[in-house]
Amino acid sequence: AMDLILINSLPLVSDAETSLTCIASGWRPHEPITIGRDFEALMNQHQDPLEVTQDVTREWAKKVVWKREKASKINGAYFCEGRVRGEAIRIRTMKMRQQASFLPATLTMTVDKGDNVNISFKKVLIKEEDAVIYKNGSFIHSVPRHEVPDILEVHLPHAQPQDAGVYSARYIGGNLFTSAFTRLIVRRCEAQKWGPECNHLCTACMNNGVCHEDTGECICPPGFMGRTCEKACELHTFGRTCKERCSGQEGCKSYVFCLPDPYGCSCATGWKGLQCNEACHPGFYGPDCKLRCSCNNGEMCDRFQGCLCSPGWQGLQCEREGIQRMTPKIVDLPDHIEVNSGKFNPICKASGWPLPTNEEMTLVKPDGTVLHPKDFNHTDHFSVAIFTIHRILPPDSGVWVCSVNTVAGMVEKPFNISVKVLPKPLNAPNVIDTGHNFAVINISSEPYFGDGPIKSKKLLYKPVNHYEAWQHIQVTNEIVTLNYLEPRTEYELCVQLVRRGEGGEGHPGPVRRFTTASIGLPPPRGLNLLPKSQTTLNLTWQPIFPSSEDDFYVEVERRSVQKSDQQNIKVPGNLTSVLLNNLHPREQYVVRARVNTKAQGEWSEDLTAWTLSDILPPQPENIKISNITHSSAVISWTILDGYSISSITIRYKVQGKNEDQHVDVKIKNATITQYQLKGLEPETAYQVDIFAENNIGSSNPAFSHELVTLPESQAPADLGGGKMLL
């Protein structure tokens, strides 16, 4: 994920300004980039520290600029270093005097293990001195003065990794400042091979890309990108994703680009020469103009991009019919993602032609770890790579990069991940109240450890000694009642907080234990409540035979309906009744009872009763005579509650007859509210009276009611309870 590029602007130093710029393109280093002198390559070079400054035009770039007056101190070897995951990536380059006696053919030279190599220096100045060649500052070879050729060569018939290094050439009377340098890079493997044992075949790197012996990946020259370096960048751009731009008037002219080994240094595409200031000749393109265009059908050769194929054709020479390749694009990836710590499955989605494959999509963590997809699928338009991070933690927060590298080009999209700590209450919940089947809990959700905001809260509970799963209820308030608990059972309680987002359930907080009360005995059976007097009620029940040895008693609660007057009475368990006294006459009372041991019992249903009346009852109301026939009639009435009415008397006689000739019908069930008089004479007028009796006496009727029976053949009539004043 590290795209480190060192630009050596004018490696041949004259009296002009010269610089080194190190760019970490598309990458966000934790540790700063460093530029330094490469004493490994040249021990006896200048010791002055370098003035490294931030390149103001780029966020992640450092620069060393030498003014023309410092020219004498510049000769030597340099490096740029970037670190990722503790691993250093170092790029090396050199600067030498333009007035040196010899000049190298190239600044660097990359060969494969076993190659037949000639390292050559061109003689620029003729001197009557022996020529000497050094490797990494140590003498290796000399040529007598009269035999110094125009091209001074070091021949390595079978190059090995140990042959790699900085080779310098000068006359024997010269010094470091008149030396010419070139660096030989020997790939650890033979041509087209890579891997620890060099037994893997390299991808065919096009456009002079170089196969990395450790990864098998192509290191693409400046101006090309993609898995095989086949895709040309837009004009004057470079970098692994072609996002960097040469700002010069003539693009990348006079920029020597140095990339990580085994690439070495080269000009950008379209330029050649030690100073990269010469344009390619017609028919040539690419880095150092080393590539020849052999375009099919006379297609145009562009010195920067090679053959410009007609639509429908592709390949370096436009030799393949096929859909034009489209650089991949990363889509639907937000700039910022908030993630809860725990399992995380980021998704990277990309378009392009050909569609990216599983191997071509990676995710790079802030520490530089490269992740490969755990799952992969594609549609007609997109490839979707799903990555799995089993446990993402807050230190993983930072800039992650989705990277897609296909034959059609490479694209990287950085995005910020903010990993949140799941919330966890610091305190256990508090138990405010308990019964045999409920508990009132303060969940104590604050303070909590971790990140909010809290989306929801769960109260988890389970019996301690049961092998049951935790049950939970969603809670909104701090105070919550747990119902349907088991009596006399120890429970564990804890609170789980949930923050927004997937996997937002925090770890449950501290556990609180509590025990529910024992279940109470059932209420007494056969409860009966009757008035005893004007001030007493009598409550009776069946004898109680408890199942345990525990002492028990009967608790009776009575309260007045009319007044706020309540009393609880404890009755020994061996009794079967209690007299409730000191009551008010003509008042309704509600009574209930329970059997208590150490645990309170279950209340009975409510019973109601009135104390006996202290006044005469009122006259029955709503008296109606209906359904009159020739021999019968129905009388109905209502009575007022609360007067201890024990019976109703209906008194009737034929009108005009003597008082003593009346008939009394006594109805002893006061709940009956109608009665059918039978055995009446047809076509006869009767006088009917009705009155109520209680413990004090009878009510006084104010009216008598008239009832006239029908002739024998007629249908029943309703007189509507007409009244006649006596």
Partner: antibody, heavy 112, light 112 residues
């Protein structure tokens, strides 16, 4: 191939047989022309690699295929709809840039 | 997608006269290699289309030199000098710069 009369929901497979040249040297393009309407490019198949490209409107129910030994390209349309009623042409280029130089006589597919 | 527009649905012409048929594209058809990827076809009644002009101005093999093509990046013209009876049919322009290739709606050449 000859005209086809099909019902909605059925599948049709029409053929385009090449002769007089090496079949794998030229890709085959398919073009649709609804009755009384203009031409619409459907896509193409690379006869050498079998790689296919479909225009957006022809992704899903349409499939190009090859029988190289018989120098024949095929267009298959699945789950036919009334709007698939059209003449379907196959075409190839003459050389590097003269595309659509040779055309088949067209196959009328009627969906009714 | 690039949209090709042929404004005239039909063009009446007297035999022996010259006629121009125009076509516009929604974006430039000029490729970075300097070529303009605009093609012209003639479809005679009941026949397959026939390539007339490729890359804006190049005459296809076997096409009489009475036909010529010209234009800029987005505006194109097919010119027929000395129209003959056999020139009747529908003329289509097509762009081959980008996928999907797209045709104009067609312009019918009618003899007065």
């Amino acid at each position: 191939s000859g005209p086809e009369l099909k019902k909605p929901g059925e599948t049709v497979k029409i053929s385009c047989k090449a002769s007089g040249y090496t079949f794998t040297d030229f890709s085959i393009h398919w073009v649709k022309q609804a009755p009384g309407k203009g031409l619409k490019w459907m896509g193409w198949i690379n006869t050498e690699t079998g790689e296919t490209t479909y225009a957006e409107d022809f992704k899903g129910r349409f499939a190009f295929s090859l029988e190289t030994s018989a120098s024949t390209a095929y267009l298959q349309i699945n789950n036919l709809k009334n709007e698939d009623t059209a003449t379907y042409f196959c075409s190839r280029r003459y050389d590097y840039d003269t595309w659509f130089a040779y055309w088949g006589q067209g196959t009328l597919v009627t969906v009714s | 997608d690039i949209v090709m527009t042929q404004a005239a649905l039909s063009v009446p012409v007297t035999p022996g006269e010259s006629v121009s048929i125009s076509c516009r594209s929604s974006s430039s058809l000029l490729h970075r290699n300097g070529n303009t990827y605009l093609y012209w076809f003639l479809q005679r009644p009941g026949q397959s289309p026939q390539l007339l002009i490729y890359r804006m101005s190049n005459l296809a093999s076997g096409v009489p030199d009475r036909f010529s093509g010209s234009g800029s990046g987005t505006a194109f013209t097919l010119r027929i000098s000395r129209v003959e009876a056999e020139d009747v049919g529908v003329y289509y322009c097509m762009q081959r710069l980008e996928y999907p290739f797209t045709f104009g709606g067609g312009t019918k050449l009618e003899i007065k």
